[in-house]
Amino acid sequence: STGAASSHCQKTSLRVNFEDIGWDSWIIAPKEYDAYECKGGCFFPLADDVTPTKHAIVQTLVHLKFPTKVGKACCVPTKLSPISILYKDDMGVPTLKYHYEGMSVAECGCR
Amino acid sequence: STGAASSHCQKTSLRVNFEDIGWDSWIIAPKEYDAYECKGGCFFPLADDVTPTKHAIVQTLVHLKFPTKVGKACCVPTKLSPISILYKDDMGVPTLKYHYEGMSVAECGCR
């Protein structure tokens, strides 16, 4: 996602309030959580910590030579973590889901 | 990667010449190939064809409410394909690698 061009691709905090996104209608708890976000640029040379694919390396090299032909690789979540949520099931019974997958960034990389 | 905001996230052609990126020193053939690129925006609501993760959906909703707080999800390769390359091994023998992985975009998505 977007980020200051001065910083390289990294994971930063992103507090999300379920009421803000309209999910409070079914998620009882938590009221908010840290989704994190991937922020920053994918600059040449791509560092090992952004685990670039070969395609990302190629795209970065093409961008370096022809900046108007193709954009840089993008800083995105490459590994996600679950969170635990309390929600109402279809019977209206409050139910705990320990692993609601893919809700929080674990790792960022250049893709 | 970057793309016209008017079009949604999709795979488009990106011809890459190995000489342009300095890889002609070790890749003998092909001289060029289609790496493809992922281009376009990840707009609300995220369509099924961009296979959004839950995090991408959350980020899109937060961006919708607070556009300055967080950027949109990014259109990136979600599946890569190999290409075949001819290169010189350490004995100087031209060698065919049938599956040089991760070189070409197979699918794009919003992450």
Epitope: - | I28, A29, Y33, S84, M91, T95, L96
Partner: antibody
Framework: QVQLVQSGAEVKKPGASVKVSCKAS????????MHWVRQAPGQGLEWMGE????????NYNEKFKSRVTMTVDKSISTAYMELSRLRSDDTAVYYC???????????WGQGTLVTVSS | EIVLTQSPATLSLSPGERATLSCRAS??????????MNWFQQKPGQAPRFLIY???NQGSGIPARFSGSGSGTDFTLTISSLQPEDTAVYFC?????????FGGGTKVEIK
């Protein structure tokens, strides 16, 4: 450096068999396919087949399939080509050659002349 | 099997002249963006020498005056400035499929 040294010239009678050897040095023997190519006097090149020294797998030219056997002895880095039921038109120079995995013949032996005559 | 037809059968030129040798395949030799065409030089009483591979790449130690071009079914070996030591028979070979096949050869003579 890479070297392929072949066995000496042979004279055989029609119906007999011949076994030509090719001793390899200067590289890891099991790394590349070994090809056999023959050339009749004043004629062009004819591919006979190839063997993978690592597993012993072979690909033969259909023309020779019933008469040719390619083998290797990894312990002495040597490839062999045996041709049976010889005819006078088998008179040729037989070459071994190291093949890249895409089929190009990169290094060649010096050749072995096999003469079939009654 | 793939049939390779070389022309002319004999080429007689003066030193310094440009030699153009042709090889036509009965079907395309292209696969994976690679042309599976090789050229060999054979001098009298000697084993063939690996000259050009993958249509346009020089083998180790081959003088720059030798170049290859072409794709699909039509290939050319060019000797830019003939030298007396270039007197030889030149064979094309396809390595796309088994059986590997050779052309009938072109004999190059120096006047």
């Amino acid at each position: 450096q890479v070297q392929l040294v072949q066995s000496g010239a042979e004279v055989k009678k029609p119906g007999a068999s011949v076994k030509v050897s090719c001793k390899a040095s200067g590289y890891t023997f099991t790394r590349y396919w070994m090809h056999w190519v023959r050339q009749a006097p004043g004629q062009g090149l004819e591919w006979m087949g190839e063997i993978n020294p690592s597993q012993g797998g072979t690909n033969y030219n259909e023309k020779f399939k019933s008469r040719v056997t390619m083998t290797v002895d990894k312990s002495i880095s040597t490839a062999y080509m045996e041709l049976s039921r010889l005819r006078s038109d088998d008179t040729a120079v037989y070459y071994c050659a190291i093949g890249a995995n895409y089929g190009g013949l990169v290094y060649w032996g010096q050749g072995t002349l096999v003469t079939v005559s009654s | 099997e793939i049939v390779l037809t070389q022309s002319p059968a004999t080429l007689s030129l003066s030193p310094g002249e440009r030699a153009t040798l042709s090889c036509r395949a009965s079907e395309s030799l292209d696969n994976y963006g690679i042309s599976f065409m090789n050229w060999f030089q054979q001098k009298p009483g000697q084993a063939p020498r690996f000259l050009i591979y993958a249509a346009s790449n020089q083998g180790s130690g081959i003088p720059a005056r030798f170049s290859g071009s072409g794709s699909g079914t039509d290939f050319t070996l060019t000797i830019s400035s003939l030298q007396p030591e270039d007197t030889a028979v030149y064979f094309c070979q396809q390595s796309k499929e088994v059986p590997r096949t050779f052309g009938g050869g072109t004999k190059v003579e120096i006047k």
